[in-house]
Amino acid sequence: SEVEYRAEVGQNAYLPCFYTPAAPGNLVPVCWGKGACPVFECGNVVLRTDERDVNYWTSRYWLNGDFRKGDVSLTIENVTLADSGIYCCRIQIPGIMNDEKFNLKLVIKPAKVTPAPTRQRDFTAAFPRMLTTRGHGPAETQTLGSLPDINLTQISTLANELRDSRLANDLRDSGATIRIG
């Protein structure tokens, strides 16, 4: 049986999944798929990690936690009704039939008030949210030096999120300029 999680249209959905690495750095592959966990692997894979990195992801799907510490919780950005359904988190522990499988049912509710598209979504469309996967995407996705200057008077709604987000760290580390005012 699956456990039910809820989100509203336009929000980010959070699907928790964890494991305890046998030792620091002793990671196991993890896959996330749309649909219940099959006998092996994940069907319709939306994100995958290996022993070192996030090696596959699709747009809007990211890990906000630190998967190197065993936090492999999935965030789905800006959900729509079409995102409803069962998701599989599979911890691919070595050995025959050792995998840990979690079937999570995501229920999307219509937004109470349909929000106008925010500037923040404009921004994330231009710079995909994989930038906030806590720096654990493949190396080439972390080359942020080419980001343009960002004028936060034009993207004021982004300011609060930047304050406590990985993106702020990534932007700071990349040397991109954030102008306020």
Epitope: V3, E4, P16, T20, P24, G70, F102, R166
Partner: antibody, heavy 117, light 107 residues
Framework: EVQLQQSGAELVKPGASVKLSCTAS????????MHWVKQRTEQGLEWIGR????????KYAPKFQGKATITADTSSNTASLQLSSLTSEDTAVYYC??????????WGQGTPLTVSS | DIQMNQSPSSLSASLGDTITITCHAS??????LSWYQQKPGNIPKLLIY???KMHTGVPSRFSGSGSGTGFTLNISSLQPEDIATYYC?????????FGGGTKLEIK
């Protein structure tokens, strides 16, 4: 052997700030989330917040936003908790704990903090 | 925030008894629940994680069960050293939260 050694008891005046420390041995703090938990006398456990020492990212309980600041120094393998604008309500034992990743498998011995004039 | 409602708040039982402590989450936390024992004057110690997995060195008379929103901690054949306060904790999402605790006394 995994150990979390916390700094000693503190007696401070209202309005002051204090910084408590938690030094780890037997593991590298950058490999784990490090948390702080408050316990007032004869009361329950309250989660204050946590840090990812690998990059300094923090999370706080809303109640402790602005009151608590958690930092980590990976070179000394130490996590710290700073509490500001102290009042008698902050008198408590403060524990550091390691999570793995969603439960606390090791705890420090606790640091008693007394706020009194 | 996810509220963790733990009951009873106190419990008196006889040696050899089996006791049950319950914890109810205000929203689903799947199996991301742990149980801790805190003896008087001591630090909390992990008993159970992932709702039912026993931590290393914990006596087999302790067991946990449940998923979703309802969880139980069972202690069978109660021993004098089990006098303590027991807490549940959800580690699914921030802010982390604890139950209010159950103080166990021996009759």
């Amino acid at each position: 052997e995994v150990q979390l050694q916390q700094s000693g008891a503190e007696l401070v005046k209202p309005g002051a700030s204090v910084k408590l420390s938690c030094t780890a041995s037997g593991f590298n703090i950058k490999d784990y989330y490090m948390h702080w938990v408050k316990q007032r006398t004869e009361q329950g456990l309250e989660w204050i917040g946590r840090i990812d020492p690998e990059d300094g990212e923090t999370k706080y309980a809303p109640k402790f936003q602005g009151k608590a600041t958690i930092t980590a120094d990976t070179s000394s393998n130490t996590a710290s908790l700073q509490l500001s604008s102290l009042t008698s309500e902050d008198t408590a034992v403060y524990y550091c704990a390691r999570s793995n990743p969603y439960f606390f498998d090791y705890w420090g011995q606790g640091t008693p903090l007394t706020v009194s004039s | 925030d996810i509220q963790m409602n733990q009951s009873p708040s106190s419990l008196s039982a006889s040696l050899g008894d089996t006791i049950t402590i319950t914890c109810h989450a205000s929203q689903t936390i799947n199996v991301w629940l742990s149980w801790y024992q805190q003896k008087p004057g001591n630090i909390p110690k992990l008993l159970i994680y992932k709702a039912s997995k026993m931590h290393t060195g914990v006596p087999s008379r302790f067991s946990g069960s449940g998923s979703g929103t309802g969880f139980t901690l069972n202690i069978s054949s109660l021993q004098p050293e089990d006098i303590a306060t027991y807490y549940c904790h959800q580690g699914q999402s921030y802010p982390y939260t604890f139950g209010g605790g159950t103080k166990l006394e021996i009759k």
